[in-house]
């Protein structure tokens, strides 16, 4: 079945942009001017997931790349990774749970909770140029709030 998708960029609440850092990692840093073109464009898709009043299940792919953010256990710790998929089969309505994030939108701020690991969120560090990761705390030092902007093609 077809899936509703959109193209967007994400910035953390400190206005750090997300860029590629090697082939399978994202990092967050402040960008200005022409450097803004480096930021990753996501293809966010509405997918099937568990129901809750304030949560909407989405998958986050990298636009025109066969890469999706996914959540897996590494050394017994929930970990965020970029995973390669077969572009013929993705995106799809019933994404595997590791690809699903519960989008929580409050006052124009977005959080992305892992469906696979409840209460773990896509996070950035306060520090510049650090990897985007899956964090198990909200409201602490690490940043879990993002803003979204549509990308015009």
């Amino acid at each position: 079945a077809p899936v509703r998708s959109l193209n967007c960029t994400l910035r953390d609440s400190q206005q750090k942009s997300l860029v590629m850092s090697g082939p399978y990692e994202l990092k967050a840093l402040h960008l200005q001017g022409q450097d803004m073109e480096q930021q990753v464009v996501f293809s966010m898709s509405f997918v099937q997931g568990e129901e809750s009043n304030d949560k909407i299940p989405v998958a986050l792919g990298l636009k025109e790349k066969n890469l999706y953010l996914s959540c897996v256990l590494k050394d017994d710790k929930p970990t965020l990774q970029l995973e390669s998929v077969d572009p013929k089969n993705y995106p799809k309505k019933k994404m595997e749970k590791r690809f699903v994030f519960n989008k929580i939108e409050i006052n124009n701020k977005l959080e992305f909770e892992s469906a696979q690991f409840p209460n773990w969120y896509i996070s950035t560090s306060q520090a510049e140029n650090m990897p985007v990761f899956l964090g198990g705390t909200k409201g602490g030092q690490d940043i879990t709030d993002f803003t979204m902007q549509f990308v015009s093609s």
């Epitope: 959109l6 967007c8 509405f46 129901e51 979204m148 902007q149």
Partner: antibody, heavy 119, light 108 residues
Framework: EVQLVESGGGLVQPGGSLRLSCTVS????????MSWVRQAPGKGLEWIGI???????YYASWAKGRFTISKDTSKNTLYLQMNSLRAEDTAVYFC?????????????WGQGTTVTVSS | DIVMTQSPSTLSASVGDRVTITCQAS??????LSWYQQKPGKAPKLLIY???TLASGVPSRFSGSGSGTDFTLTISSLQPEDFATYYC??????????FGQGTKVEIK
């Protein structure tokens, strides 16, 4: 305060074209999806389509081909281009804001603009 | 495409009555169901989303329930300002959005 104001309605002949506008304030089209919905005289609500970014538009099956949704984020304006108009397209046309991305529900509406297709 | 069917089409009631409107989806839409109120010559107003969550500023006499294919809007004690037409709508990020045909609540 969230405001949506439609314009561009009027009388058009069958087979003609019309472009409706919806100017918004109190929020940005760069982070909210927008739908067009219409209502024929004495009838119910009918969804036409929705736009996210300019490359991501979705339409009711009956609207594909004749209706095109676009937007100019810098002008905070949404558009509905209607071609090959028929008598049955006579309706009040509303623009509406999606409450949250992919929520599907609409929490802000314009007052509507009336389109009459008649010779 | 999903078809939303409301019943009844018209409902005659008095102030203070408990009123129930039903909406049926032609296939499961989980809890992605919204309700709107529309008064003559006005734009629709969002009342309820995600089947049971009251939109901002909506009085608590309105409530919604259901999931899958069967949904209900209830007004616990009808007030003069509640005489209007009510629409259900399948929501969520599915490809197609559809409204029910509407239920007109009129004075008995």
């Amino acid at each position: 305060e969230v405001q949506l104001v439609e314009s561009g309605g009027g009388l058009v002949q069958p087979g003609g074209s019309l472009r409706l506008s919806c100017t918004v304030s109190g929020f940005s089209l760069s982070s909210y999806a927008m739908s067009w919905v219409r209502q024929a005289p004495g009838k119910g609500l009918e969804w036409i389509g929705i736009i996210y970014d300019s490359a991501s538009t979705y339409y009711a099956s009956w609207a594909k081909g004749r209706f095109t949704i676009s937007k100019d984020t810098s002008k905070n304006t949404l558009y509905l281009q209607m071609n090959s108009l028929r008598a049955e397209d006579t309706a009040v046309y509303f623009c509406a804001r999606e409450r949250q991305i992919f929520s599907g529900d609409m929490d802000g509406w314009g007052q509507g603009t009336t389109v009459t297709v008649s010779s | 495409d999903i078809v939303m069917t409301q019943s009844p089409s018209t409902l005659s009631a008095s102030v203070g009555d408990r009123v129930t409107i039903t909406c049926q989806a032609s296939q499961s839409i989980s809890s992605y169901l919204s309700w709107y109120q529309q008064k003559p010559g006005k734009a629709p107003k969002l009342l309820i989303y995600k089947a049971s969550t009251l939109a901002s500023g909506v009085p608590s006499r309105f409530s919604g329930s259901g999931s899958g294919t069967d949904f209900t809007l209830t007004i616990s004690s009808l007030q003069p300002e509640d005489f209007a037409t009510y629409y259900c709508q399948n929501a969520g990020g599915g490809i197609n959005i559809a409204f029910g045909q509407g239920t007109k609540v009129e004075i008995k």
